[in-house]
């Protein structure tokens, strides 16, 4: 019997009865938060062989082993994972061993076994036989191995029953408990599973089988299960589902899961029955079960219940992530915030259409509206009083609407209104009228020429660069000396520069009024000599990197009511010179014969130019006679290898550490102080543990059901 779509057993151990007839759990299995120690011996679920997602155990008092509960659990598929893990055993106070002696395969994901104070038999399990990669396993904070004294079956009687494998250079017996070995298949089976009698299973079997070479006798399937048979692919008119079985179209059409209830139902795509069309695809019609490729970014319609969505923080903007069509009105009211422009672009940058109006008011943190980088249509189906569909009021730092050279925006219905935007030049507003097709709709008072742009240098002159010189990490630029009508109005220049791999940056990228700015800024004073052109040396740059640079004249803002002229340059793109590359990474050498060495390496992390070739140098080294002075057949450890540069590999002290004379003074050696890298690694480790624990708590603590 297939049980699903995930089983959560908590608070009451008797809920375990729900597993009684399950052979496959299609989904996850949670057993957690059972605080009263119970006797679990009467609970046994021998039918359960496969969990398609993950197994999570957390704070189950009194449970000493999983072997009696799940004696035949063979495969955890890891189709969906719990924070990258397919098996999580966390804070199981009484667990003494894992004991899942029939667990043969964790198809995807790693394991996390942490903070189980009584848990032993961890070092006796060879996880590499169960998982593809053991490097992501996290086994920390359990009972120290020295206190465990793990013994595999028959070891005491000197009749060991289990097989040996090597883990971390230790060749040892592998077992789950004192009386259960870890099963290994004969090498003749290769990657195939085997029966209890060591006969090889059919190649489509995973984990184990009840009869050899029979695709109907598998405990679990390597690929897909259909009508009692393990198959490499789903037959015609059936579709892959949940990563393990084949279902028909009707089944797929009728799925109503808690996770997918808001969607339009499951879809069939690329031979799979799935919850939504994958990235880059959209349904072929609103109620279709089939997907077609999107042209450009896939549309995602978002609707606001209350008709008007107020964006007053990053959190409120977050709700619009991925939306391309917004059904309703946008009211933007961003008074403050950290790194606000790029955050808003991240969450609102895909919006192409707003069906109602857009109102930007009291948004003192905004310098530009370029964060709405894909907005192309305001329908104006709903308008503000006075028939306004684009309304911009009292934004103290707003300087740019959009980069009109690269922007097509249409306002289908309604008028525009601009007032009290002191840094927004009227010319910018008039340009918007032309682009959006609203010219002629506005009445005289809708665009206030007195209080828009009153504190800005609106009639800009163009500053021209006169020379550029580059080296590997420096750029020297000079520009024409700017002469405003009254020379006293010119205070200084500001040079803006940043890395720009592509020639597509604008002045307002990532800029807001709260100090965030993706541009580096350098102030340049006027040269005292009137004949000398102003210039700057930008240093500390990266070799072979393209930079964008522009210069602005800093001028007095206002003389009474006259708008004063400002000046700035076009954006200049300039690349620093190439330099010596950093060293090649991960150099490995191995000998494949008595006269050849194979050397491999990865490219340098900083090529600092276009790499054209590598130089490989080698030289013959004299053989170290020290190597011959050790009997390699003895059980003692191989001696420490001494290296020419004076550094040595510190051998981990195992038994009977001897006190040695160090540094000319008597006394034991002290542990070396931790390096910065080690300290950083420890810090990251602690942080990672916290993040996981938070994730665990957030995932499993839910309000009590009604």
């Amino acid at each position: 019997e297939i049980c699903g779509p995930g089983i959560d057993i908590r608070n009451d151990y008797q809920q375990l009865k729900r597993l009684e007839n399950c052979t496959v759990i299609e989904g996850y299995l949670h057993i957690l938060l059972i605080s009263k120690a119970e006797d679990y011996r009467s609970y046994r679920f021998p039918k359960l062989t496969v969990i398609t997602e993950y197994l999570l155990l957390f704070r189950v008092a009194g449970l000493e082993s999983l072997g009696d509960l799940f004696p035949n659990l063979t495969v955890i598929r890891g189709w969906k994972l719990f924070y990258n893990y397919a098996l999580v055993i966390f804070e199981m106070t009484n667990l003494k061993d894992i004991g899942l002696y029939n667990l043969r395969n964790i198809t995807r994901g790693a394991i996390r076994i942490e903070k189980n104070a009584d848990l032993c038999y961890l070092s006796t399990v060879d996880w590499s036989l169960i998982l593809d990669a053991v490097s992501n396993n996290y086994i920390v904070g359990n009972k120290p191995p020295k206190e465990c004294g793990d013994l595999c079956p028959g070891t005491m009687e000197e009749k060991p029953m289990c097989e040996k494998t090597t883990i971390n250079n230790e060749y040892n017996y592998r077992c789950w408990t004192t009386n259960r070995c870890q099963k290994m298949c004969p090498s003749t089976c290769g990657k195939r599973a085997c029966t209890e009698n060591n006969e090889c299973c059919h190649p489509e079997c995973l984990g184990s089988c009840s009869a050899p070479d029979n695709d109907t006798a598998c405990v679990a399937c390597r690929h897909y299960y259909y009508a009692g048979v393990c198959v490499p692919a789903c037959p015609p008119n059936t579709y892959r589902f949940e990563g393990w079985r084949c279902v028909d179209r009707d089944f797929c059409a009728n799925i109503l899961s808690a996770e997918s209830s808001d969607s339009e139902g499951f879809v069939i795509h690329d031979g799979e029955c799935m919850q939504e069309c994958p990235s880059g695809f959209i349904r072929n019609g609103s109620q279709s079960m089939y997907c077609i490729p999107c042209e450009g970014p896939c549309p995602k319609v978002c609707e606001e219940e209350k008709k008007t969505k107020t964006i007053d923080s990053v959190t409120s903007a977050q709700m619009l992530q991925g939306c391309t069509i917004f059904k309703g009105n946008l009211l933007i009211n961003i008074r403050r915030g950290n790194n606000i422009a790029s955050e808003l672009e991240n969450f609102m940058g895909l919006i192409e259409v707003v069906t109602g109006y857009v109102k930007i008011r009291h948004s003192h943190a905004l310098v530009s509206l370029s964060f709405l980088k894909n907005l192309r249509l305001i329908l104006g189906e709903e308008q503000l009083e006075g028939n306004y569909s684009f309304y911009v009021l009292d934004n103290q730092n707003l300087q740019q609407l959009w980069d009109w050279d690269h922007r097509n925006l249409t306002i289908k219905a309604g008028k525009m209104y601009f007032a009290f935007n002191p840094k927004l030049c009227v010319s910018e507003i008039y340009r918007m009228e032309e682009v959006t097709g609203t010219k002629g709709r506005q009445s005289k008072g809708d665009i206030n020429t007195r209080n828009n742009g009153e504190r800005a240098s609106c009639e800009s002159d163009v500053l021209h660069f006169t020379s550029t010189t580059t080296s590997k990490n420096r750029i020297i630029i000079t520009w024409h000396r700017y002469r405003p009508p009254d020379y006293r109005d010119l205070i200084s220049f500001t040079v803006y520069y940043k890395e720009a791999p592509f020639k597509n940056v604008t002045e307002y990228d990532g800029q807001d009024a709260c100090g965030s700015n993706s541009w580096n800024m350098v102030d340049v004073d006027l040269p005292p000599n009137k004949d000398v052109e102003p210039g700057i040396l930008l240093h500390g740059l990266k070799p072979w990197t393209q930079y964008a640079v522009y210069v602005k004249a800093v001028t007095l803002t206002m003389v009474e009511n006259d708008h004063i002229r400002g000046a700035k340059s076009e954006i200049l793109y300039i690349r620093t010179n190439a330099s010596v590359p950093s060293i090649p990474l991960d150099v490995l050498s191995a000998s494949n014969s008595s006269s050849q060495l194979i050397v491999k390496w990865n490219p340098p992390s900083l090529p600092n130019g276009n790499l054209s070739y590598y130089i490989v140098r080698w030289q013959r080294q004299p053989q170290d006679g020290y190597l011959y002075r050790h009997n390699y057949c003895s059980k003692d450890k191989i001696p420490i290898r001494k290296y020419a540069d004076g550094t040595i590999d510190i051998e981990e002290v195992t038994e009977n550490p001897k006190t040695e004379v160090c540094g000319g003074e008597k006394g034991p050696c002290c542990a070396c102080p931790k390096t910065e890298a080690e300290k950083q690694a420890e810090k990251e480790e602690a942080e990672y543990r916290k993040v996981f624990e938070n994730f665990l708590h957030n995932s499993i603590f839910v309000p009590r059901p009604e």
């Epitope: 019997e1 297939i2 049980c3 699903g4 779509p5 995930g6 089983i7 959560d8 729900r18 007839n21 399950c22 989904g27 089944f251 059409a253 009728n254 799925i255 109503l256 899961s257 808690a258 996770e259 997918s260 209830s261 339009e264 139902g265 609103s286 109620q287 059901p705 009604e706």
Partner: antibody
């Protein structure tokens, strides 16, 4: 693989409350789907009574709304029907069934409830 | 409530001959999402109902292709191209587009 099993008294006295339970195995009732009660008076057609959804919300047939309650016990993976003030007209085979996005895909085998004194 | 009216209520058939059952709804059963949730169920004697056709014309996987459904708006039809002995039972139409969901009163198909 999903199984539904109705249980409850086969005989109820008039004016009393009819109580039935549907035990679901093979699928968690909180995981999705709409969990329905449907009845069929002897020799007559099928009549939809109502459902409880995976998230606990209900929908009832308006003519029965004042007398019917469908509830659930998530720890036992069961949902229940209570029909108060029964009369002989409530004598029927009562089915529990699962409804997805489009149709009923699993039905119980039905249990006959007779209303008689 | 939407009333589903089936005709005929009884349909004696000869094996190998075609049969047709009509189902009319008292109002349109097109859902707001554009789908028409009209199903046909067969209830064999002593059994629970089993689904044959969903969303007007989609035959359930495993149902013989002699069964077909058609119609739109308020008028729907179930056709059996060649009746077989195992097709006897009561056929119900059902609408799941508007709550309360409703069944037709049933059409009894029996062999002549």
């Amino acid at each position: 693989q999903v199984q539904l099993q109705e249980s409850g008294p086969g005989l109820v006295k008039p004016s009393e409350t009819l109580s039935l339970t549907c035990t679901v195995s093979g699928y968690s009732i909180t995981g999705g789907y709409l969990w329905n009660w449907i009845r069929q008076p002897p020799g007559k057609g099928l009549e939809w009574i109502g459902y409880i959804s995976y998230d606990g919300t209900n929908n009832y047939k308006p003519s029965l709304k004042d007398r019917v309650t469908i509830s659930r016990d998530t720890s036992k993976n069961q949902f229940s029907l209570k029909l108060s003030s029964v009369t002989a007209a409530d004598t029927a085979v009562y089915y529990c069934a699962r409804y997805g996005r489009v149709f009923h895909d699993y039905w119980g085998q039905g249990t006959l409830v007779t209303v008689s004194s | 409530d939407i009333v589903m009216t089936q005709s005929p209520l009884s349909l004696p058939v000869t094996p190998g001959e075609p049969a047709s059952i009509s189902c009319r709804s008292s109002q349109s059963i097109v859902h707001s999402n554009g789908n028409t949730y009209l199903q046909w169920y067969l209830q064999k004697p002593g059994q629970s109902p089993q689904l044959l056709i969903y969303k007007v014309s989609n035959r359930l996987y495993g149902v013989p292709d002699r069964f077909s459904g058609s119609g739109s708006g308020t008028d729907f039809t179930l056709k059996i191209s060649r009746v077989e002995a195992e097709d006897v039972g009561v056929y119900y139409c059902f609408q799941g587009s508007h709550v309360p969901w409703t069944f037709g009163q049933g059409t009894k198909v029996e062999i002549k």
